[in-house]
């Protein structure tokens, strides 16, 4: 166990052109407060993911109003450290998001206003116990200048706060089969403690903040016991002695969330549905009021005046969870065409396209006529990933560069013969029959089935299709 | 700015049937992908049935076979057609679309219908 400890230093415009504006007015003074939130390892998860290692507040700045005419500062900044306990090991690579949120002091209907001002992520490396390290990270144009480590709480020590140590108990040796604990020479590593709450009857470890179970129990700290009355819905080990099947312990067995929070499984391990009021992995973290800010992503914190009465985050659209942290799966509608891929970056959905799509949801087709020409007078016309030619008469081919032999279709018909010519082709029809394809029969009594033909045509006469 | 309405909610019996339609007005915009998500208390809000910006239509693995999601384009309006439904279903109902105003896309909810089954 131990804690992660965040030090802001400064907070306010970064070098160079385009400074922002100042976040706040004399019409709407405002000040500032810091979240951060951590995760084990070096994933590039989404800022909305769970903070599995932990989250914290800051308190509030001081208030701020902007004084006219003058550049933006560096912004007065809440007293103190950010603090996050981890209660298992120290993880060694962790990701971090900070959050720098405003929150407006002006005549706001319903109380104060929050909106993100910048967030900044990263990916680091950090040995438990080591001196403090220091950032500078940028988000548009502002800059953060912040500290961190990483210390265990006694008696855990160690780059990942595994170890145990002990005062020694004699001045000139350790326990037996116990050894100094370096670099603390006057102390001994003190023996395994197990996980907080594991049975002492029905559990031991191997490791520490290890609870494992004693044949017949089962759950997280080996408090439930194993039903024999049915074997028969197998699942896990056989039981010695019963002989029959037992249920082996899943991740919710014995509900690991506190405070009345629901367990669910998921693929990797549970998730905890907190009860308003509490959040945190396990729903550890409670006796936070309105004032704290617990609504992330512009939610609206409703009620929660003081520790002992519950608030309530309305969250705005596309947020949920008890404290607006989860964004919905919006990419889960499939809007990218093309088989492009979807990426929901909070403020927008994107398309990352296949090759030859384009567009902001990869709805252009690069292949088609872009860049393509039909020769001969050909018209290009777009479908289905490749471009193809509507040839004008007279030619054809993919490209329309081949000399088309318009008479090889036979379109003339009842027994006409048909003619090449530049502009098309030409039916001379057989008798009793007109038309431009030879297609309607002249009647016995001279008169044809449509409007008589054109001045100066008999029927029979050949005739041009243009 | 464009308004998804929803309608159609209300309580019904297990094995009973609803249908629900979105209406999307606005001025001078397209729809790319238009579907209903579902909250259930304390849940996550999840896609339902959908057509995908492809046209395709999507389902929950949950509602394959019970569910069939419509739209009429003439009215710029979809359907769920809900059949067979569960205690399992009840949640709020939730209309979203990806929508093309002028020549940017921005994404769109309904303020969502109830849905409630119970004996």
């Known amino acids: 166990a131990g804690v992660f400890e965040l030090q802001i230093h400064s907070f306010g415009p970064g070098p160079g052109p385009g400074a922002p504006r100042s976040p706040c007015s004399a019409r709407l003074p405002c000040r500032l407060f810091f979240r951060v939130c951590l995760k084990p390892g070096l994933s590039e998860e989404a800022a909305e993911s769970p903070c599995a290692l932990g989250a914290a507040l800051s308190a509030r700045g001081p208030v701020y109003t902007e004084q006219p005419g003058a550049p933006a500062p560096d912004l007065p900044l809440p007293d103190g450290l950010l603090q996050v306990p981890f209660r298992d090991a120290w993880p060694g690579t962790f990701s971090f998001i900070i959050e720098t949120w405003r929150e407006e002091l002006g005549d706001q209907i319903g109380g104060p206003a929050w909106s993100l001002l910048a967030r900044v992520a990263g990916r680091r490396r950090l040995a438990a116990g080591g001196p403090w390290a220091r950032d500078i990270q940028r988000a548009g144009a502002w800059e953060l200048r912040f500290s961190y480590r990483a210390r265990c709480e006694p008696p855990a020590v160690g780059t990942a706060c595994t170890r145990l140590c002990r005062p020694r108990s004699a001045p000139s040796r350790c326990g037996p089969g116990l050894r100094p604990c370096a670099p603390l020479e006057d102390e001994c590593e003190a023996p395994l403690v197990c996980r907080a709450g594991c049975s002492p009857e029905h559990g031991f470890c191997e490791q520490p903040g290890e609870c494992r179970c004693l044949e017949g129990w089962t759950g997280p700290l080996c408090t439930v016991p194993v039903s024999t009355s049915s074997c028969l819905s197998p699942r896990g080990p056989s039981s010695a002695t019963t002989g029959c099947l037992v249920p082996g312990p899943g991740p919710c067995d014995g509900n690991p969330c506190a405070n009345g929070g629901s367990c669910s499984e998921t693929p990797r391990s549970f998730e905890c549905t907190c009860p308003r009021g509490f959040y945190g992995l396990r729903c550890e973290v409670s006796g936070v009021t309105c004032a704290d800010g617990p609504c992330f992503n512009g939610g609206l914190c409703v009620g929660g005046a003081d520790p002992d009465s519950a608030y309530i985050c309305h969250c705005p659209p596309g947020f949920q969870g008890s404290n607006c942290e989860k964004r919905v799966d919006r990419c889960s509608l499939q809007p990218c065409r093309n088989g492009g891929l979807c990426l929901d970056l909070g403020h927008a959905l994107r398309c990352r396209c296949r090759a030859g799509f384009a567009g902001p949801r990869c709805e252009h087709d690069l292949d088609d006529c872009a860049g393509r020409a039909c020769a001969n007078g050909g018209t290009c016309v777009e479908g289905g990933g490749a471009h193809r030619c509507s040839c004008a008469l007279g030619f054809g081919g993919r490209d329309c560069r081949e000399r088309a032999d318009p008479c090889a279709a036979r379109p003339c018909a009842h027994g006409g013969r048909c003619y090449a010519h530049f502009s098309g082709l030409v039916c001379a029809c057989a008798p009793g029959y007109m038309g431009a394809r030879c297609e309607f029969p002249v009647h016995p009594d001279g008169a044809s089935a449509l409007p008589a033909a054109p001045p100066g045509l008999r029927p029979g006469d050949p005739q041009r299709y243009l | 700015e464009v308004q998804l309405v929803e309608s159609g909610g209300g309580e019904v019996q297990p094995g009973g049937s609803l249908r629900l339609s979105c209406a999307a007005s606005?001025?001078?915009?397209?729809?790319?992908?238009i579907g209903w998500y579902r909250q259930a208390p304390g849940k996550q809000r999840d896609l339902v049935a959908g057509f995908t910006g492809d046209g395709v239509t999507t389902y929950a693995e949950s509602v394959k076979g019970r569910f069939t999601i419509s739209r009429d384009n003439a009215k710029n309006t979809v359907y769920l057609q809900m059949s067979s439904l569960r205690a399992e279903d009840t949640a709020v109902y939730y209309c979203a679309a990806d929508v093309k105003i002028g020549g940017d896309y921005e994404w769109f909810w309904g303020q969502g219908t109830l849905v409630t089954v119970k004996p």
């Open positions: 606005g001025s001078d915009f397209s729809i790319n992908a």
